[in-house]
């Protein structure tokens, strides 16, 4: 039975040209996290594996940095980076947990972080 909950940074906004940290946290389970995959809509951005460490997709290497922790840092943001991001936690024995973050990249200098929220 999957009892865990993923907490994410929720709906966030950032300025064009800036950077942002995408962060998820799995709680309420004793399952072992074996791997976390980060996806942007239909693109695999990065993977953090408990044994192998980080793999950043080559096409994103210039603008994506691993961490902090199991999170992901996006740099040199463009308006095209606006959209949904997913953290997919592969765990044993529970299975897979998915968290969703919506990022809006703004042209203006007024970019405020949204509230954190939970996805069961």
């Amino acid at each position: 039975m999957m009892t865990g909950t993923i907490e994410t940074t929720g709906n966030i906004s950032a300025e064009k040209g800036g950077s942002i940290i995408l962060q998820c946290h799995l709680s309420s389970t004793t399952a072992q996290v074996t791997q976390v995959n980060w996806e942007q809509q239909d693109q695999l951005l990065a993977i953090c594996n408990a044994d192998l460490g980080w793999h950043i997709s080559p096409s994103f290497k210039d603008r994506v940095a691993p961490g902090p922790g199991l999170g992901l840092t996006l740099q040199s943001l463009t308006v095209n980076d606006t959209g949904e991001y997913f953290c997919i936690y592969h765990t044993y024995p529970d299975g897979t947990y998915t968290g969703r973050i919506f990022l809006e990249v703004l042209e203006s200098s007024v970019a405020e972080h949204g509230a954190r929220f939970q996805i069961p």
Epitope: T34, D42, Q43, N49, D51, L52, H55
Partner: antibody
Framework: EVQLLESGGGLVQPGGSLRLSCAAS????????MNWVRQAPGKGLEWVAN????????SYADSVKGRFTISRDNSKNTLYLQMNSLRAEDTAVYYC???????????WGQGTLVTVSS | DIQMTQSPSSLSASVGDRVTITCRAS??????LNWYQQKPGKAPKLLIY???SLQSGVPSRFSGSGSGTDFTLTISSLQPEDFATYYC?????????FGGGTKVEIK
């Protein structure tokens, strides 16, 4: 240099059993998921089974579920496939393949032929 | 199970030609799509992983694109050593599944 070397193939009668081995070298075997993939003569590739790095989790194709068992011995850097209740349709070349991040298979062995026939 | 449909099943081409092979998934697989090359009597060789990432040591004339359900493998200028069978494979979910293969033959 990464190397995967399968062994254990051969001729077996329907209903019989066979155990395939895959000896790994040139990388930290215990850090990688591993797969068995097979190819019937003149046919395409068919995934058979997967085992996670620690051996804690396995998955199988429906066609072999309940008959085949994938396992590993990380102290011996060896992957296994125990095949029971073999059928004619199991006749194929069996490859072991390394599966980094469970997303792709980057190194393959040369394969071992299993023939199920009376 | 996710079905992978490759087309064409075979094609004839000449050295220097641009060759395109397509692969369609029966449901969205994000970018969890790999391409392999296989020559007769040999093990498959990884060319492209995660839809568009070129495997180390693979010539840059090979490229992959697509996401969701539709994917393409392109060989920009076919070389003599490229005549082989090419397979796509999804790793979005188990059971892992392969396309039926595309045999690239000499015209």
């Amino acid at each position: 240099e990464v190397q995967l070397l399968e062994s254990g193939g051969g001729l077996v009668q329907p209903g019989g059993s066979l155990r395939l081995s895959c000896a790994a070298s040139g990388f930290t075997f215990s850090s990688y998921s591993m797969n068995w993939v097979r190819q019937a003569p003149g046919k395409g590739l068919e995934w058979v089974a997967n085992i996670k790095s620690s051996g804690s989790s396995t998955s199988y194709a429906d066609s072999v579920k309940g008959r085949f068992t994938i396992s590993r011995d990380n102290s011996k850097n060896t992957l296994y496939l125990q095949m029971n209740s073999l059928r004619a349709e199991d006749t194929a070349v069996y490859y072991c393949a390394r599966g980094p991040y469970d997303v792709w298979m980057d190194y393959w062995g040369q394969g071992t032929l299993v023939t199920v026939s009376s | 199970d996710i079905q992978m449909t490759q087309s064409p099943s075979s094609l004839s081409a000449s050295v220097g030609d641009r060759v395109t092979i397509t692969c369609r998934a029966s449901q969205s697989i994000s970018s969890y799509l790999n391409w392999y090359q296989q020559k007769p009597g040999k093990a498959p060789k990884l060319l492209i992983y995660a839809a568009s990432s070129l495997q180390s040591g693979v010539p840059s004339r090979f490229s992959g694109s697509g996401s969701g359900t539709d994917f393409t493998l392109t060989i920009s200028s076919l070389q003599p050593e490229d005549f082989a069978t090419y397979y796509c494979q999804q790793s979005y979910s188990t059971p892992l599944t392969f396309g039926g293969g595309t045999k690239v033959e000499i015209k």
